[in-house]
């Protein structure tokens, strides 16, 4: 369960891959597409509003919380649209939705080496947002082996003067 309904904090950031490709969002035919691309020098990076929530570890939902909390995040590149996991299609999509957000919009945040982060599906533990063929996809990761896999590592470049209503 998500602890409370409001985020503990929010920040505005641009998102890039471990290899410094930018994650960009484009409105095409009334729906948003997500791209992973090398940005031209002067092109501005797309911003994403990250909202951080606390959640109990699944194992302690009925207990006293000693297993601690997980930090969960939702990612919104434009007003009323959120990144969501489509576990059936192994895809990452942008959907318009109202609060309360569906579980598919929540990702467990993992801090990694080199100040990178990974995003694990709340709805499908062991499945992470990753890069596949210049697109974002859902990638199954063996916990004990490949948590450092470069294709699930992302860099957040925070824009410090953030506003809650963006775009």
């Amino acid at each position: 369960s998500i602890t409370g309904i409001s985020p503990i904090t929010e920040s505005l950031a641009s998102l890039s891959t471990y290899n410094d490709q930018s994650i960009t969002f484009a409105l095409e035919d009334e729906s948003y597409e997500i791209y992973v691309e090398d940005l031209k020098k002067d092109k501005k990076k797309d911003k994403v509003l990250l909202s951080y929530y606390e959640s109990q570890h699944p194992s302690s939902e009925s207990g006293d919380g000693v297993d601690g909390k997980m930090l969960m995040v939702t990612l919104s590149p434009t007003k009323d649209f959120w990144l969501q996991a489509n576990n059936k299609e192994h895809s990452v999509e942008l959907h318009k939705c109202e609060k309360p957000l569906p579980d598919q919009a929540f990702f467990v945040l993992h801090n990694r080496s080199f100040n990178c982060v990974s995003f694990e599906c709340k709805t499908d533990p062991g499945v992470f947002i990753g890069v596949k063929d210049n697109h974002l996809a859902l990638i199954k990761v063996d916990y004990s082996e490949n948590l450092g896999s470069e294709n699930i590592l992302f860099k957040l470049s925070e824009i410090l003067e953030h506003h809650h209503h963006h775009h």
């Epitope: 920040s11 570890h57 930090l71 945040l109 080199f114 948590l147």
Partner: antibody
């Protein structure tokens, strides 16, 4: 309840190594990164690195990179921090700590061991 | 590395006083700042996380605020057990770094 119990005080000669243990109980050991800090007498706190008990992956502060090794034994829920080539300025209390969040350091350190005093003296 | 500058390094106050400790980061850390209290011979104790969230079990006289580079810890009404040392810590990027500490002493 969550407990981190560290090994006892050590006195070492310069050039020697020390290995401090941190036994975790009251939670799923593999579900939380373990961090190590130290505090020299009368000084502030210094972060040394972390280990992911699940994978064994580590990340060390550059200052300690060539002298520190963090390991774990999941069968006994214990993390270890070994510091080699000890110098007199390594004299400090060494702490293990568990973060508020399982795999993120953003929330700070919620649970701490009681500390292990390591004295380096000839 | 992100440097954390805490001020003042010490402050003298009386029971019931309001005390404010500030912490400045050398670069922006959004809201990922923690505050700790440390009593002599003991491990630090987490008071505040995410700049303004009160850790469970910590008295409500402790509060935190700020974002970006400037943060404050406020003790609204000092109690006898509050006379000790406080540290801030940036929890944003590696290497994780602490402020130099603020000792709250009895006037």
């Amino acid at each position: 309840q969550v407990q981190l119990v560290q090994s006892g005080a050590e006195v070492k000669k310069p050039g020697a190594s020390v290995k401090v243990s941190c036994k975790a109980s009251g939670y799923t050991f593999t579900g939380h990164y373990m961090y190590w800090m130290r505090q020299a007498p009368g000084q502030g706190l210094e972060w040394m690195g972390w280990i992911n008990p699940n994978s064994g992956g580590t990340n060390y502060a550059q200052k300690f990179q060539d002298r520190v090794t963090m390991t774990r034994d999941t069968s006994i829920s214990t993390a270890y921090m070994e510091l080699s080539r000890l110098r007199s300025d390594d004299t400090a209390v060494y702490y293990c700590a568990r973060g508020r969040y399982g795999s993120s350091w953003y929330g700070g350190f919620e649970y701490w061991g009681q500390g292990t005093l390591v004295t380096v003296s000839s | 590395d992100i440097q954390m500058t805490q001020s003042p390094s010490s402050v003298s106050a009386s029971v019931g006083d309001r005390v404010t400790i500030t912490c400045r980061a050398s670069q922006g850390i959004t809201s990922w700042l923690a505050w700790y209290q440390q009593k002599p011979g003991k491990a630090p104790n987490l008071l505040i996380y995410a700049a303004a969230s009160l850790q469970s079990g910590v008295p409500s006289r402790f509060s935190g605020s700020g974002s970006g580079t400037d943060f404050t810890l406020t003790i609204s009404s000092l109690q006898p057990e509050d006379f000790t040392t406080y540290y801030c810590q940036q929890a944003y990027s590696l290497p994780l770094t602490f402020g130099g500490g603020t000792k709250v002493e009895i006037k």
